[in-house]
């Protein structure tokens, strides 16, 4: 499956996005930081078949997708700038579930994805309880906004690779 | 009864690499991630890797990364961890660890064996 | 990497004696801060889960609270058997880390 050259600029436009949303200062937030545990190992594309690096290309978008759909979310972030943000991550996700469809059909999905998947689910839940213990503060949603760009950027490099590969 | 018995430990010398097994019964090992934790003779716990229960979801302690391959055979119930490079600083206990979810992360180490110790020296 | 604090590093305490051994994190863990206990020559054994949920087959006497970066491991009334060494342990994020462990010595 071939991702449409629109998904890449749609990826970069989210990011832009995202980067835009930013209302206060990183450097205020600093007593706020916080280690998430991103999965990078998940993201570094070299053990996956193309069928797995697309499922969990997938459910990164889904669950930044939802995190980013909940009202504590609305109330946090410029309404514009968040809808084309959620618009640009619902575009993705279209582009990614055909991908899905075509791929599944070509190689079966190992079970080891099954592992990537929950990993990226934990993941966000210890977001959510992030935000949950700082009481959807302004600094603790601006440290996730600094969270989901780093992210993203490790899925738009995963996805340039995927593309090489083709 | 639930078990988990290490095997492979032994005498190595520095730069010498080692294979540990782990061989796992009384639980339905495909279910349960497996991690290797470590302790030197005297001294505390280190972590050292871990394996979703699929095989996929590898993780490292940043002391081994690049010299330690973890990985598992469900059909078999056997945990392994492949090392290499093995220093002075690798000598201690390697226990195999069953944790409580199906891969690392927000949970608990709930089953141990009972170690193999692994001595680097010249 | 989240470091793992504990103390005291060693106690000693009479039997019957109520003992509480300390555990803090350097960022917040939420509630997945796990406690260890190790007899001598023995491998390590589960006894507190999540910070305060007690493993089947461990003694009453032992609870856990807390939740962020404060942990504590209560022994209410400290018994014989309870010699050992203690260990708290991150599990909210890998690399999963230990505390240094406590020494618990019967008097």
């Known amino acids: 499956c071939d991702l449409p050259q629109t998904h890449s600029l749609g990826n970069r436009r989210a990011l832009i996005l995202l980067a835009q949303m930013g209302r206060i200062s990183h450097f205020s937030c600093l007593k706020d930081r916080h280690d998430f545990g991103f999965p990078e190992e998940e993201f570094d594309g070299h053990q996956f078949q193309k069928a797995q690096a697309i499922s969990v290309l997938h459910e990164m978008i889904q669950q930044t997708f939802n995190l980013f759909s909940t009202e504590d979310s609305s109330a946090a972030w410029e309404q514009s700038l968040l809808e084309k943000f959620s618009t640009e991550l619902y575009q993705q996700l279209n582009d990614l579930e055909a991908c899905v469809i075509q791929e599944v059909g070509v190689e079966e999905t190992p079970l080891m994805n099954e592992d990537s998947i929950l990993a990226v689910r934990k993941y966000f839940q210890r977001i959510t309880l992030y935000l949950t213990e700082k009481k959807y503060s302004p600094c603790a949603w601006e440290v996730v906004r600094a969270e989901i760009m780093r992210s993203l950027s490790f899925s738009t490099n995963l996805q340039k690779r995927l593309r090489r590969k083709d | 009864e639930m078990q988990l018995m290490e095997s492979g430990g032994g005498l190595v010398q520095p730069g010498g690499s080692l294979r540990l097994s782990c061989v796992a019964s009384g639980f339905t090992f495909k279910s349960f991630a497996m991690s290797w934790v470590r302790q030197a003779p005297g001294k505390g716990l280190e972590w050292v890797a871990s394996v979703g229960s699929q095989g996929g979801s590898k993780y490292y302690a940043p002391s081994v990364k690049g010299r330690f391959s973890i990985s598992r055979d469900n059909s078999n119930n056997t945990l392994y961890v492949q090392m290499n490079s093995l220093g002075v600083e690798d000598t201690a206990f390697y226990y195999c660890?069953?944790?409580?979810?199906?891969?690392?992360?927000?949970?608990?180490?709930?089953?141990w064996g009972q170690g193999t110790l692994v001595i680097v020296s010249t | 990497d989240i470091r793992v604090t504990q103390s005291p590093s060693s106690l000693s305490a009479s039997v019957g004696d109520r003992v509480s051994i300390s555990c803090q994190t350097s960022q917040s863990v939420n509630i997945y801060l796990n406690w260890y206990q190790q007899r001598p020559g023995k491998g390590p054994q589960l006894l507190i889960s999540a910070a305060s949920t007690l493993q089947s087959g461990v003694p009453s006497r032992f609870s856990g609270s807390g939740s962020g970066t404060d942990f504590i491991l209560t022994i209410i009334s400290l018994q014989p058997e309870d010699s050992a060494s203690y260990y708290c342990q991150q599990g909210y994020i890998t690399p999963y880390t230990f505390g240094q462990g406590t020494k618990v010595e019967i008097k």
């Open positions: 660890v069953k944790e409580t979810d199906a891969v690392a992360t927000m949970d608990a180490l709930d089953m």
